[in-house]
């Protein structure tokens, strides 16, 4: 099995250093009263998904179909990445999660050049769609850190709901209460190989 | 519904040139690794050579290695193989080869070849 | 460099099941395509990822791999299934291809 969990706090602390560098541009664009969620995003970054028992995510796009596994890999095989690009919310919150002054990290993930994870809370899936900037709220998932190095990803749009796995595929998942955030099948693993 | 057609073949003597193109349609072209894989004479396919969509980076056989050149113009959807130094070896039929699925990020040529044209040859002859 | 190889051909009566292997080195640690190409046509996709067939391709043909083999299988072989079939894996960035088998229908 692949153990990818220990690359990952290695890009989150440094996120502290990031933060601070960023409060300024926050207070600014606060005074002026611009949209935070209107600037660029803190960082980005490219890790390859993994969940919490090490099976990879990967991703398989034409221009009219897609398809998201959830597998093991092949030994030779090179893991997908995706592109995580963390916000900060406009909304302070009360949840435990990364962030600055109460307010939460908010990540948009794209497996490849124009295409992002979108949250369908209707029919309870993981998408990807093609869109562009500024991407909808279906988009952004506060981000997590949850126990073991691994994250989670709740929907921006649906509170309480995160991305999970189900079936050997990536669903949306309600969790009822605090305790089933550490639930396995909606813990992640990013890994920078 | 996804089209590739190539063109550029023909006779050339040993030691010339040819240019090769592969005009795509049908698909987003800038999001797919592109290759060529040709056919000698009744044998069988061998990869010449591809490119990546995010980087653009190159591949090479041993074989075509500092002879060929692969490169693609997105805006004008097309892939390109330039061919010097032609040997008698490098008779065959050229394909032009979509990638199944879009590039990752990660890159690199890692996806089995979806889509292909209809091929050009060339012959390279005194 | 790395080297797959084919039987050169294979013969199958009509209905039966035909079976064609690509032999590599760790071959299972890689995922194994095959491509159908009839005779003065481009080559056609009809397994990728060992076992999955593209939306077309009819559900007679199957593959499997592991160890150093990869095995397309062809169930209720059809005249029309004559054809050269080709198996292909990524390695290192560059695409290596089998030497091709000759499925004949007799």
């Known amino acids: 099995m692949h153990h990818h969990h220990h690359h990952h706090h290695h890009h989150a602390a440094g996120l502290n250093d990031i933060f601070e560098a960023q409060k300024i541009e926050w207070h600014e664009a606060a005074i002026e009263g611009r949209s935070i969620t209107g600037i660029s995003p803190i960082t980005e970054y490219l890790a390859s998904l993994s969940t919490y028992n090490d099976q990879s995510i990967t991703f398989a796009l034409e221009d009219e179909s897609y398809e998201i596994y959830v597998e093991d890999l092949k030994k030779d095989e090179k893991k997908d990445k995706v592109l995580l690009s963390y916000y900060e919310s406009q909304h302070p919150s009360n949840e435990s999660g990364d962030g600055v002054d109460g307010k939460m990290l908010m990540v948009t993930l794209s497996p490849t050049k124009d295409f992002w994870l979108h949250a369908n809370n209707k029919e309870h899936s993981v998408e990807l769609h093609k869109c562009e900037k500024p991407l909808p709220d279906q988009a952004f998932f506060v981000l997590h850190n949850m126990h073991s190095n691994c994250v989670s990803f709740e929907c921006k749009t649906d509170p309480g709901v995160f991305i999970g796995v189900k079936d050997n595929h990536l669903a949306l998942i309600k969790v009822d209460s605090s305790e089933n955030l550490c639930t396995e099948n909606i813990l992640f693993k990013l890994s920078e190989t | 519904e996804v089209q590739l057609l190539e063109s550029g073949g023909g006779l050339v003597q040993p030691g010339g040139s040819l240019r090769l193109s592969c005009a795509a349609s049908?698909?987003?072209?800038?999001?797919?690794?592109m290759s060529w894989v040709r056919q000698a004479p009744g044998k069988g396919l061998e990869w010449v050579s591809g490119?990546?969509?995010?980087?653009?980076?190159?591949y090479y056989a041993d074989s075509v290695k500092g002879r060929f050149t692969i490169s693609r113009d997105n805006s004008k959807n097309t892939l390109y193989l330039q061919m010097n130094s032609l040997r008698a070896e490098d008779t065959a039929v050229y394909y032009c080869?979509?990638?199944?699925?879009?590039?990752?990020?990660?890159?690199?040529?890692?996806?089995?070849?979806?889509?292909w044209g209809q091929g050009t040859m060339v012959t390279v002859s005194s | 460099s790395y080297v797959l190889t084919q039987p050169p051909s294979v013969s199958v009566s009509p209905g039966q099941t035909a079976s064609i292997t690509c032999s590599g080195e760790r071959m299972g640690d890689k995922y194994a395509a095959w491509y159908q190409q009839k005779p003065g046509q481009s080559p056609v996709l009809v397994i990728y990822r060992d076992t999955k067939r593209p939306s077309g391709i009819p559900e007679r043909f199957s593959g499997s791999n592991s160890g150093n083999t990869a095995t397309l299988t062809i169930s209720g072989t059809q005249a029309m299934d004559e054809a050269d079939y080709y198996c292909e894996v990524k390695k290192s960035d560059t695409g290596v291809f089998g030497g091709g088998t000759k499925v004949t229908v007799l």
């Open positions: 049908g698909f987003t072209f800038s999001s797919y690794a």
């Open positions: 080869a979509r990638d199944l699925w879009m590039e990752n990020w990660v890159g690199g040529l890692r996806y089995p070849f979806g889509y």
């Open positions: 490119i990546s969509a995010i980087d653009q980076s190159t």
